[in-house]
């Protein structure tokens, strides 16, 4: 089956410049600001665009090792980034993959709207663990904070 | 256990160059960032800049842009703070510390190096 | 590029009192603002990460509060050993003026 969760979250940095450190730079910014959370970013393959694959590790005493992901769609225009989870961390025998898609919203104060949709993909009639889905959001919202006090620091970065 | 370890104090004259270090060990030296703070006697505490041993990134604050270099080599654990001509008003306590993984609370500091400049 | 501005500049309490001081930033820093307590000759110490995160270790009198642009840290039952320098500062940035704590 597939299980939808939809999420909205706000940020102080405007749409364009959390678009470029978040989602076009996050390989390179995530283990510098949040190494409590993802220890390295490598790329398989690809350049970035749809087809990409990157391995993405997290420290020692997470319940995973590390996650593949597929880079489905960037669109630079919209600030949209698509892309799924394929391999490691919950992916196996009950979820197939989970399909992730970000657009960043530009907000009259001068910050952003994150909307995020996150497919789950499970095989059979397997049912998505809550767990799961918690831990996944409390990763981006640990991802997006960090990343955020970063270019709060740094007006020049980004820009 | 996470520690910083500073070279000692150093006397110099105005116009001559320097170079302080900065050692650390007890955690993955290469993944925090690592700051640099001055502080003149008597005063407060102020951000140089910060150093990212995995790439060597760094990120300098505007009024100390052009008056000091900051690296690091991750190969030995080591950050160091640099001055190619000193000056009188370069005297200060100048402390490293280790930018936690929260939101960058500096959570290991080192024991501090003392820099006097005078002729 | 954000100031940190604190107050006061100096207070003078005692042993048991309820301390507080506050920090302002020029403008929104979320919550991404640090407290450090410093002693003479000593180098500084984390007490709270994150505006309101006590750090490990650090006694639980201490706390931390705020978001936006103004913070405030508190010492519920000031003790002879919290008599020093107390500095705000942004992640990553600025830190305030300090603080200094006096014995009355």
């Known amino acids: 089956g597939v299980f939808n969760y939809e999420t909205e979250t706000t940020s102080v940095i405007p749409a364009a410049r959390l678009f470029k450190a978040f989602i076009l730079d996050g390989d390179n910014l995530f283990p510098k600001v949040a190494p409590q959370a993802i220890s390295s970013v490598e790329n398989i393959e690809g350049n970035g665009g749809p087809g990409t694959i990157k391995k993405i590790s997290f420290p020692e005493g997470f319940p995973f090792k590390y996650v593949k992901d597929r880079v489905d769609e960037v669109d630079h225009t919209n600030f949209k980034y698509n892309y799924s989870v394929i391999e490691g961390g919950p992916i196996g025998d009950t979820l197939e993959k989970i399909s992730n898609e970000i657009k960043i919203v530009a907000t009259p104060d001068g910050g952003s709207i994150l909307k995020i949709s996150n497919k789950y993909h499970t095989k059979g009639d397997h049912e998505v663990k809550a767990e799961q889905v918690k831990a996944s959001k409390e990763m981006g919202e640990t991802l997006l904070r960090a990343v955020e006090s970063y270019l709060l620091a740094h007006s020049d970065a980004y820009n | 256990e996470v520690q910083l370890v500073q070279s000692g104090a150093e006397v110099k004259k105005p116009g001559d160059s320097l170079k302080i270090s900065c050692k650390g060990s007890?955690?993955?030296?290469?993944?925090?960032?690592i700051g640099w703070v001055r502080q003149m006697p008597g005063k407060g505490l102020e951000l140089m800049g910060i150093?990212?041993?995995?790439?060597?990134?760094?990120k300098y604050r505007p009024s100390f842009l052009g008056q000091v270099t900051i690296s690091a080599d991750k190969s030995i654990a080591t950050a160091f703070l640099q001055w190619s001509r000193l000056t009188a008003s370069d005297t200060a306590i100048y402390y490293c510390?280790?930018?936690?993984?929260?939101?960058?609370?500096?959570?290991?500091w080192g024991q501090g190096t003392l820099v006097t400049v005078s002729s | 590029d954000i100031q940190m501005t604190q107050s006061p500049s100096s207070l003078s309490a005692s042993v048991g009192d309820r301390v507080t001081i506050t920090c302002r930033a020029s403008?929104?820093?979320?919550?991404?603002l640090n407290w450090y307590q410093q002693k003479p000759g000593k180098a500084p110490k984390l007490l709270i990460y994150?505006?309101?995160n006590l750090q490990s270790g650090v006694p639980s009198r201490f706390s931390g509060s705020g978001s936006g642009t103004d913070f405030t840290l508190t010492i519920s039952s000031l003790q002879p050993e919290d008599f020093a320098i107390y500095y705000c500062?942004?992640?990553?940035?600025?830190f305030g003026e300090g603080t200094k704590v006096e014995i009355k």
């Open positions: 150093v990212y041993p995995g790439d060597s990134d760094t």
């Open positions: 510390a280790r930018l936690g993984a929260t939101y960058a609370g500096a959570d290991f």
């Open positions: 994150a505006a309101s």
């Open positions: 500062q942004q992640s990553y940035a600025a």
């Open positions: 007890g955690y993955s030296f290469s993944n925090f960032w």
């Open positions: 403008q929104t820093i979320v919550t991404y």
